[in-house]
């Protein structure tokens, strides 16, 4: 997966810090007070359609075999810069009933975008 | 996540069927002949960027604060209708030292669609 | 501490309609669903809907659908619940509750509001 | 929709003796992550409903330790291990799995 450098306008991972005290989230999360996110950005031309970061899903791949030779409903289909691989992380925070938990949330930070 | 009925135009799961003899890889892939890969398909409008079938990751969330909000970049971020929860599949196929694998294929059959 | 208040007790004719509101202090609004629920005299708990904050996503239980429409303002931590076409049988108290942070619809509710009482009476 | 089914209805008790709820689902509340999506409440007169258990079993912050949630799939057990004065009133248990959300019918728990 591409990481964002200024240069091209191709699909590729921006860094982004997300602080929980500015998005008021710092009310039930405890720990830490803010963490690396990222995002994905730029475009998704057709000849990297179906590109999820450095490997392809068999999906993908798929679905961008009948994106290519124009099938409809396909060719329209747009191609979108998504987060291919999220990384958990570790959080104290309070839970639904109030207690204080410690665990390993999924989806947390994006390593890696491609195109879908 | 939403399955696509023909009324609706917001992020669905659309059914689809690939026959892997039309799409030519029938001269690797020993069975199944073909399966419902399926796609997704629809509209995301900001109300429900960030939702993700029933539940919302932690970082779409995140990214759907911002966006909700305004702010740059994330205002301008397109908000696309991406598989969410993808299904393994197993097949049977040659290798490239044309040895017979019996495998389980990630990533093979889009379960749930939701808005990036 | 968490308080959510709500607004107070209302007589309502039949036909009408009524929106009932739901102020949350002592935190914030946003990563959690807050779910509508009621209970008409001497009867049981009776869930109408919610609506997940962080995306402004409403869902309707089948019974309620074309009749309540639930709402919500960040700027002011608020959400509201509005039903129509009022009946006698609609006669209850109306709870507002908040789930947890980024549960959905799959939310434990910890915090209640104190109940709003709405008569329908011609 | 899922439908609770609670017994007994009305539960008579002494005080310092155990007492045990029963809640029973149309179908499975074990999600596929591992939780069962079942809380039980507690109502006490002319109060606002208050969570007691959680995902089947976990205890809210504040409850006493004498209330434990158990069970899983269709059949969950609440049970107090001695009761105490306070706590009179009727208790629901709710399923989260899917909407519509729904409540069993409750179980009143009077002092004899």
């Known amino acids: 997966g591409l990481e964002c450098d200024g240069k091209v306008n191709i699909c590729c991972k921006k860094q982004f810090f997300v602080s929980f005290k500015d998005i008021g989230w710092n009310d039930w999360i405890i720990a830490p007070s803010g963490y690396h996110a990222n995002y994905c950005e730029g475009e998704c031309p057709s000849h990297i359609a179906g590109t999820s970061g450095s490997s392809l899903s068999f999906h993908s791949t798929v679905i961008n075999h009948y994106r290519m030779r124009g099938h409809s409903p396909f060719a329209n289909l747009k191609s979108c810069c998504v987060p291919t691989k999220l990384r958990p992380m570790s959080m104290l925070y309070y839970d639904d009933g109030q207690n204080i938990i410690k665990k390993d949330i999924q989806n947390m930070i994006v390593e890696e975008c491609g195109c879908s | 996540g939403l399955e696509c009925d023909g009324k609706v135009n917001i992020c669905c799961k659309k059914q689809f069927f690939v026959s892997f003899k039309d799409i030519g890889w029938n001269d690797w892939i020993i069975a199944p002949s073909g399966y419902h890969a399926n796609y997704c398909e629809g509209e995301c409008p900001s109300h429900i960027a960030g939702t993700s079938g029933s539940s919302l990751s932690f970082h779409s969330t995140v990214i759907n604060h911002y966006r909700m909000r305004g702010h740059s970049p994330f205002a301008n971020l397109k908000s696309c209708c991406v598989p969410t929860k993808l299904r393994p599949m197993s097949m049977l196929y040659y290798d490239d030292g044309q040895n017979i694998i019996k495998k389980d294929i990630q990533n093979m059959i889009v379960e749930e669609c939701g808005c990036s | 501490q968490v308080q959510l208040v709500q607004s107070g007790a209302e007589v309502k004719k039949p036909g009408s309609s009524v929106k009932v509101s739901c102020k949350a202090s002592g935190g914030s609004f946003s990563p959690y669903t807050i779910s509508w629920v009621r209970q008409a005299p001497g009867q049981g708990l009776e869930w109408m809907g919610g609506i997940i904050l962080t995306s402004g996503t409403a869902n309707y239980a089948q019974k309620f659908q074309g009749r309540v429409t639930i709402t919500a303002d960040e700027s002011t931590s608020t959400a509201y619940m509005e039903l129509s076409s009022l009946r006698s049988e609609d006669t209850a108290v109306y709870y507002c509750?908040?789930?947890?942070?980024?549960?959905?619809?799959?939310?434990?509710?910890?915090?209640w509001g104190q109940g709003t009482l709405v008569t329908v009476s011609s | 929709d899922i439908v609770m089914t609670q017994s007994p209805l009305s539960l008579p008790v002494t005080p310092g003796e155990p007492a045990s709820i029963s809640c029973r689902s149309s179908?499975?509340?074990?999600?596929?992550?591992?939780?069962?999506?079942l809380d039980w409440y507690l109502q006490k007169p002319g109060q606002s409903p208050q969570l007691l258990i959680y995902?089947?079993?976990n205890r809210a912050s504040g409850v006493p330790d004498r209330f434990s949630g158990s069970g899983s799939g269709t059949d969950f057990t609440l049970k107090i291990s001695r009761v105490e004065a306070e706590d009179v009133g009727v208790y629901y248990c709710m399923q989260a799995l899917q909407t519509p959300i729904t409540f069993g019918g409750g179980t009143k728990v009077e002092i004899k």
């Open positions: 509750a908040r789930g947890g942070p980024l549960s959905g619809w799959r939310a434990s509710y910890y915090y």
């Open positions: 179908q499975s509340l074990l999600h596929s992550n591992g939780y069962n999506y």
């Open positions: 995902l089947g079993s």
